[in-house]
């Protein structure tokens, strides 16, 4: 009788304990899941916006950026939501028709009005940065440059945004902000180690990428050299970003953007032309174009080649020869004089190249058109492809690329040759180091260029010190808690089943 009573008690207790454990486990799992889900429920995010207009030498582009307000100082949270290319040339070309600037900017500013929620308009900053095209105009006349900027400012002030001003940025700024942009987007400033990478070109180390930017009127090279001491203070920049110091080399070569380089080449070559026909190896065979001498000498970039010519116009006749074009382009780089241990060209200091480089803007646009942006294409292959492309007859080229404007299409042979010459002879990349150049258009949906870096700086979104934060973000913490809790519950159940064999586990209940 006593044995039966004891057995019943055991059975009752075992059953209750099992039930309680089972019930508790279920409750715990439900609770953990509930906490996880509620904690990570998408709260109505406070989103901020910013607008930057890049007033380049050949055109103006408007960029809209957005970011979560509460994560302002985090790295990599700002991204581009829109790019609007303004129809027409660069603002420096409006010097004779400033009254048209308002209309010129309308479409893209209206697009910004549509993209950004109305409630955010008044607190959305608008910045306009003008680059080398306006630097050249200012070199000719501060008055004309001021007039253009004044009209631009008046036009942009008419919109409901928080207009912060229009200014000509320096070449140093252009280089530096381009470098900040690509490294910000590549996650190079983040001190957190990542388990996986969703960013292309990203290596596991925190070594920054150098930045190679090519515009219509200037080109910039910016990178962190191996040697921290510099021979040329003019080319040195110091940054402290997210708690780390960066000693950066930068130089902007005014007049060495692809369009101004072409004007330079034409001005140089016409000096030795015997008549008003310029047989040009940088244009396809059969290509013809008339150029006004007054247009050629309009820019300060051709000043050193200026001479009195016995004609007002001349005709370019393409002969399409890469090798000869390359030789002609090389004459634009003065490498005979260097007051430093090492120079790029024109006596400008250049430390030894270091690390990987992102080549963007026209470096990318031109190489992408020529289908030469692949990481697998060697420098030798690029040269071969250029030889083939330049020698193709103009009529053939027009047929093959019927959708491309002839003005742009005609200049790809020159631009491609110029890019190769600039990178190899100008900046001293080699066939081996060519693989360290990555032609980049966008990084995670944001255009590579100076505009993002400019906005990050002006909105104080790049802190000098690493922001204080927990090792894991809250959402990651909750997710891991849920995950590990589930694992523990499963392990406990499996453990019970393994260590208490069914025969032994149930034997007292018989």
């Amino acid at each position: 009788m006593e044995d039966t009573k004891e057995s019943n008690v055991k059975t009752f207790c075992s059953k209750n304990i099992l039930a309680i454990l089972g019930f508790s486990s279920i409750i715990a799992v439900i609770a953990l899941l509930a906490v996880g889900l509620t904690q990570n429920k998408a709260l109505p995010e406070n989103i901020k916006y910013g607008i930057v207009l890049d007033a380049g030498s050949s055109h103006t582009s408007l960029y809209i950026y957005k970011w979560p307000a509460e994560k302002e100082n985090d790295t990599g949270v700002v991204h581009q939501v829109e790019e609007c290319r303004v129809k027409g040339p660069g603002i420096s070309k409006y010097v004779q028709k400033v009254n048209e600037i308002g209309i010129y900017l309308t479409d893209c500013m209206e697009r910004a009005r549509e993209v950004i929620p109305r409630s955010q308009h008044q607190e959305t900053p608008v910045y306009l940065g003008a680059t080398a095209g306006m630097r050249l105009l200012r070199m000719e006349s501060e008055e004309l440059a001021d007039r253009v900027l004044d009209v631009v400012e008046r036009s942009l002030s008419n919109y409901p945004f928080d207009f912060q001003g229009a200014r000509i940025i320096t070449g140093q700024e252009e280089g530096a902000y381009g470098w900040i942009t690509i490294n910000y987007l590549l996650g190079k400033f983040s001190q957190k180690t990542r388990w996986f990478s969703i960013v292309p070109y990203e290596t596991n180390n925190q070594e920054t990428f150098g930045a190679l930017d090519l515009g219509g009127a200037s080109t910039q090279i910016t990178f962190v050299p191996q040697n921290q001491t510099t021979e040329s203070p003019d080319n040195a920049l110091q940054f402290r970003l997210y708690g780390k110091d960066y000693n950066v080399y930068t130089h902007s070569f005014l007049c060495y953007g692809k369009d101004q380089a072409l004007w330079q080449k034409l001005a140089k070559d016409i000096q030795v032309a015997s008549n008003e026909i310029l047989r040009d190896p940088c244009f396809h065979p059969g290509y013809k174009k008339v150029v006004n001498v007054s247009d050629l000498y309009k820019t300060p970039c051709t000043k050193r080649f200026e001479m009195t010519l016995p004609f007002q116009q001349f005709e370019i006749q393409g002969i399409g020869n890469y090798q000869q074009c390359h030789q002609s382009v090389l004459e634009l780089f003065n490498t005979s004089y260097c007051p430093y241990s090492q120079c790029a060209f024109n006596g400008i200091f250049l430390p030894p190249l270091q690390g990987d480089f992102g080549a963007f803007s026209a470096f990318y646009f031109v190489m992408n058109f020529l289908n030469l942006t692949s990481e697998k294409v060697s420098q030798e292959k690029v040269t071969e492809m250029m030889k083939k492309f330049c020698s193709q007859p103009w009529e053939e080229i027009k047929t093959s690329y019927a959708g491309v404007k002839e003005k742009y299409l005609s200049e790809y042979c020159f631009s491609g040759t110029y890019i190769l010459s600039l990178l190899l002879q100008g900046y001293h990349f080699t066939a081996d180091s060519w693989e360290h150049i990555h032609f980049i258009g966008k990084i995670q949906g944001s255009d590579a260029g100076w505009t993002l870096g400019y906005m990050l700086n002006l909105t104080n979104m790049i802190p000098a010190e690493q922001p204080l934060s927990t090792p894991l973000s809250h959402s990651t913490y909750v997710f891991l808690m849920v995950l590990f809790s589930l694992v523990l519950v499963i392990v406990a159940i499996i453990g019970l089943l393994i260590f208490h064999k069914p025969s032994y586990f149930w034997k007292d209940m018989v």
Epitope: V95, Q96, V98, R135, R138, M139, E140, S141, E142, E143, L144, A145, D146, R147, T170, G171, Q172, D234, L254, C255, P300, C301, T302, K303, R304, F305, E306
Partner: antibody, heavy 116, light 111 residues
Framework: QVQLVQSGAEVKKPGASVKVSCKAS????????MHWVRQAPGQRLEWIGY????????TFNQKFKGRATITVDTSARTAYMELSSLRSEDTAVYYC?????????WGQGTLVTVSS | DIVMTQSPDSLAVSLGERATINCKAS??????????MYWFQQKPGQPPKLLIY???NQGSGVPDRFSGSGSGTDFTLTISSLQAEDVAVYYC?????????FGGGTKVEIK
Amino acid sequence: QVQLVQSGAEVKKPGASVKVSCKASGYTFTDYNMHWVRQAPGQRLEWIGYIVPLNGGSTFNQKFKGRATITVDTSARTAYMELSSLRSEDTAVYYCARGGTRFAYWGQGTLVTVSS
Amino acid sequence: DIVMTQSPDSLAVSLGERATINCKASESVDNFGVSFMYWFQQKPGQPPKLLIYGASNQGSGVPDRFSGSGSGTDFTLTISSLQAEDVAVYYCQQTKEVPYTFGGGTKVEIK
């Protein structure tokens, strides 16, 4: 801040040459042209010419063409103006001035005296 | 060449009174809607100091009493209330076309 510092006073004999320097600081040297202006005693200011430091191209007042040479050393951020075949009427204070069309910054001036 | 003619050659004005200097160009110095006209102040032993650019814009750090007006060929520099430190020679200049040219100067003194 922008500063233009010129070389010291010079005394030259007629027929000789003089080279005046102008060292710039406080701005991107190659972003602005450098002009040279002179002022003879009791005379109006007279524009000599300018250089584009970016590439060394220069433009002169016809009056000085062939006699004046303007050069730059971009690494030293310095512009130079050389005037040859000096005559007594070249006695003047020579100024460098930064600008495209607006001469907002001037050097302190260099007195060049031409005397036998 | 564009000839710049300044008047008067010299001017004596009482402290606190208005001083007006004129400058006439032999042809228009306007281009693209801008007047390429400048006014400079020069004190003995010093380089010229930019007062007015683009005919009517004040140079940086220039007191409000200095103002410029005019367009085309006729321009005026006005000192609204002459101060002792304004005693100097004033020059006009055009940079519309090369060679850039200056006026003959106007000497301003205190009466």
